[in-house]
């Protein structure tokens, strides 16, 4: 390796490599400085002059040390079913994630390309597996002795109340109705609602509004109607 006193640009020793945050320029045949995140190479190095870097321009970014001639364009603004969890800055791309009540049906390297609304379990069905950032709700029929009378993406099947005297017996979509005396429960009802999936991404306290860009095709497409799964509703 060259001595620490070598300043860029310099010729590496035969078989040697360039140092950290340097790159080998094939044209100049020299080790030259990379540009830091948030900048790009405005002028490439020569045998006698080092790389000239410039800040990334409007709505563009570089996340790594680089020698690219142009910064990368930030993705298009988030669609209506998404929230911007990371703003476009000189050093990072915009990240769009699905808003509450939706999940990511088609992910991309960072954030989500396509959001879909979480399935709602119809009366007689409860949530077997709650939705997450990347998976839909799974519904199951309420077992005997349990019911769900809501159309919800969070409600589980609850136990029927136990009556001393039953007025109307319960079924999968309706609780039992008791006469006069106070009812008791067959078991503690526990948590009736499952929480909405919580994003694991840290939210910016003040997300910067998305830059306006020329209209173009968005990758963040709205979801078209699809046949409801068993026990679910398309609402």
């Amino acid at each position: 390796l060259p001595a620490q006193v070598a300043f860029t640009p310099y010729a590496p020793e035969p078989g040697g490599t360039c140092r950290l945050r340097e790159y080998y320029d094939q044209t100049a045949q020299m080790c030259c400085s990379k540009c830091p995140p948030g900048q790009h190479a405005k002028v490439f190095c020569t045998k006698t002059s080092d790389t000239v870097c410039d800040s990334c321009e409007d709505s563009t970014y570089t996340q790594l040390w680089n020698w690219v001639p142009e910064c990368l364009s930030c993705g298009s603004r988030c669609s209506s079913d998404q929230v911007e969890t990371q703003a476009c800055t000189r050093e990072q791309n915009r990240i769009c994630t699905c808003r509450p009540g939706w999940y990511c049906a088609l992910s991309k390297q960072e954030g989500c390309r396509l959001c879909a609304q979480l399935r709602k379990c119809r009366p007689g069905f409860g949530v077997a597996r709650p939705g997450t950032e990347t998976s839909d709700v799974v519904c199951k029929p309420c077992a005997p002795g349990t019911f769900s009378n809501t159309t919800s993406s969070t409600d589980i099947c609850r136990p029927h109340q136990i009556c001393h005297v039953v007025a109307i017996p319960g079924n999968a979509s309706m609780d039992a109705v008791c006469t006069s005396t106070s009812p008791t429960r067959s078991m503690a009802p526990g948590a009736v609602h499952l929480p909405q999936p919580v994003s694991t991404r840290s939210q910016h306290t003040q997300p910067t509004p998305a830059p306006s860009t020329a209209p173009g095709t968005s990758f963040l497409l709205p979801v078209g109607p699809s046949p409801p799964a068993e026990g679910s509703t398309g609402d």
């Epitope: 540009c35 830091p36 995140p37 948030g38 900048q39 405005k42 870097c53 410039d54 800040s55 321009e57 409007d58 709505s59 703003a87 476009c88 800055t89 000189r90 910067t208 509004p209 998305a210 830059p211 306006s212 860009t213 020329a214």
Partner: antibody, heavy 117, light 106 residues
């Protein structure tokens, strides 16, 4: 509260240099670029350049390359701009401004530099 | 460099009057940014990303435009709006400002 405190007015002789400071407070200094802007009396604004305090990397308006040098002292959250070989053309108010991405959301009060013999 | 031309250079408006000032770029820009400056004061961010109002800017202000042509509009002039307004672009280096539009109260 985010604030940029600039050093006081300077009266300097032609050919001399001047170093203006801009002390940042109320935010993490290394999170945003610091830009410098020149405003000659009764005239518009001219962008001089910016500095990324994290990497101490700079970007200049070609017009000010060799005229202005931008530096930072991370330990004191202070940005500096040195202007050299001063002439009457350099008589102006110089502002530091926090670069929020692609706009200057907070500005210093400005430092007036008067070049006169 | 991308030259921004603001027009008119000076204008006056009566209270309640609608005001529109323009900023034309010699090359197309992605977004336009506007600053308000009153005499002997620092510029203040006024509009960013073409149409977003900076915190504290009254809703009577709006920004619009695309490509080479942008504008700042005040729906109903108020006394405190008298100031010089500068446009700025960040699409190409060097980042440039317009020459300013000085808005006076008639």
């Amino acid at each position: 509260e985010v604030q940029l405190q600039q050093s006081g007015a300077e009266l300097v002789k032609p050919g001399a240099s001047v170093k203006i400071s801009c002390k940042a407070s109320g935010y993490t200094f290394t999170d945003y670029n610091m830009d410098w802007v020149k405003q000659s009396h009764g005239k518009s604004l001219e962008w001089i350049g910016d500095i990324n305090p994290n990497y101490e990397s700079t970007s200049y308006n070609q017009k000010f390359k060799g005229k202005a040098t931008l530096t930072v002292d991370k330990s004191s959250s202070t940005a500096y701009m040195e202007v050299r070989s001063l002439t009457s053309e350099d008589t102006a108010v110089f502002y530091c401004a926090r670069d929020k991405g692609w706009y200057f959301d907070v500005w210093g009060a400005g430092t007036t530099v008067t070049v006169s013999s | 460099e991308n030259v921004l031309t603001q027009s008119p250079a000076i204008m006056s408006a009566s209270l309640g009057e609608k005001v529109t000032m323009s900023c034309r770029a010699s090359s197309s820009v992605k977004n336009m940014y506007w600053y308000q400056q009153k005499s002997d004061a620092s510029p203040k961010l006024w509009i960013y990303y073409t149409s977003n109002l900076a915190p504290g800017v009254p809703a009577r202000f709006s920004g619009s435009g695309s490509g080479n042509s942008y504008s700042l509009t005040i729906s109903s002039m108020e006394g405190e709006d008298a100031a010089t307004y500068y446009c700025q672009q960040f699409t190409s280096s060097p980042y440039t400002f317009g020459g300013g539009t000085k808005l006076e109260l008639k």
